[in-house]
Amino acid sequence: GSVPPMVNVTRSEASEGNITVTCRASSFYPRNITLTWRQDGVSLSHDTQQWGDVLPDGNGTYQTWVATRICQGEEQRFTCYMEHSGNHSTHPVPSGNSHHHHHHHH
């Protein structure tokens, strides 16, 4: 069967007036996954995002990440979109420097 990913969104200072938002998906199976940033509901172009490889995490499951740089103060317009085994979920950027886990149940 399939194991849905744990999705975790974090933010970090990038440069003056910018922040990097990173979305990590972990502990999922099978390895096929869509992970992308959306702005105002629409997927960002590929050239504005950076992806990590889909790698085994040692438990028979997989992990990956996607990141993008955005203007500080614009965070609420962005959402990490995850799609796995026919299910999707959306994950907003937290306020401040906190990070949060969202478990997507199939």
């Epitope: 629409v42 317009r77 026919g86 299910n87 979920s89 959306t90 907003p92």
Partner: antibody, heavy 117, light 107 residues
Framework: EVQLVQSGAEVKKPGASVKVSCKAS????????IEWVRQAPGQGLEWIGA????????NYNEKFKDRVTITADTSTSTAYLELSSLRSEDTAVYYC??????????WGQGTLVTVSS | DIQMTQSPSSLSASVGDRVTITCRAS??????LAWYQQKPGKSPKLLVY???TLADGVPSRFSGSGSGTDYTLTISSLQPEDFATYFC?????????FGQGTKVEIK
């Protein structure tokens, strides 16, 4: 102009199924998630689930997961909500809405589903 | 699930009054909150999103504020067309949940 136009009112018997449609126009249908919400008479609003029309991937409220199916037909820019094993408590107005980032910006006019024996 | 507690459930006010409606979330929703206005037989209309951003075409007498778990919708000077029911909704996590609504009636 963004528009979501829903199908007409339905009357169903307990145990039956209902399928409500939501036809989108005025924007690129496959670019935005479509959400479904219901409102029982005189009550609050309840989120049912969502679909990515571009891929068909869904996200359901656990409360409805066993009885609901959300689909989309990109050739007609139409999303569908099907609810099975209907009971009287399912009597409600069912709405579709477009998900614009992190809120619903446009709503359909609503479809009244009445479940009565 | 995040529970949204809205108050009051109803209120009576006169044209020109200042009206305040509050919404409290059971957890931090990071300002991912929208307010809607609904009139009888109509679908909800978006008023405010991201807790304080006014939707296009919404009069400036409406304003939203708040952060963390506590949020407020204010109508600075109530107009005849504002008599309606108002709902809040959180978008931090699914299932997206709504407040039970506040019905604003004519005094």
């Amino acid at each position: 102009e963004v528009q979501l136009v829903q199908s007409g009112a339905e009357v169903k018997k307990p145990g039956a199924s209902v399928k409500v449609s939501c036809k989108a126009s005025g924007y690129a249908f496959t670019n935005y998630l479509i959400e479904w919400v219901r409102q029982a008479p005189g009550q609050g609003l309840e989120w049912i689930g969502a679909i990515n029309p571009g891929s068909g991937a869904t996200n359901y409220n656990e409360k409805f997961k066993d009885r609901v199916t959300i689909t989309a037909d990109t050739s007609t820019s139409t999303a569908y909500l099907e609810l099975s094993s209907l009971r009287s408590e399912d009597t409600a107005v069912y709405y579709c809405a477009r998900f614009l980032g992190n809120y619903f910006d446009n709503w359909g006019q609503g479809t009244l589903v009445t479940v009565s024996s | 699930d995040i529970q949204m507690t809205q108050s009051p459930s109803s209120l009576s006010a006169s044209v020109g009054d200042r009206v305040t409606i509050t919404c409290r979330a059971s957890g931090n929703i990071h300002s991912y909150l929208a307010w809607y206005q609904q009139k009888p037989g109509k679908s909800p209309k978006l008023l405010v999103y991201y807790a304080e951003t006014l939707a296009d075409g919404v009069p400036s007498r409406f304003s939203g504020s708040g952060s963390g778990t506590d949020y407020t919708l204010t109508i600075s000077s109530l107009q005849p067309e504002d008599f309606a029911t108002y709902f809040c909704q959180q978008f931090w996590t699914t299932p997206y949940t709504f407040g039970q609504g506040t019905k604003v009636e004519i005094k």
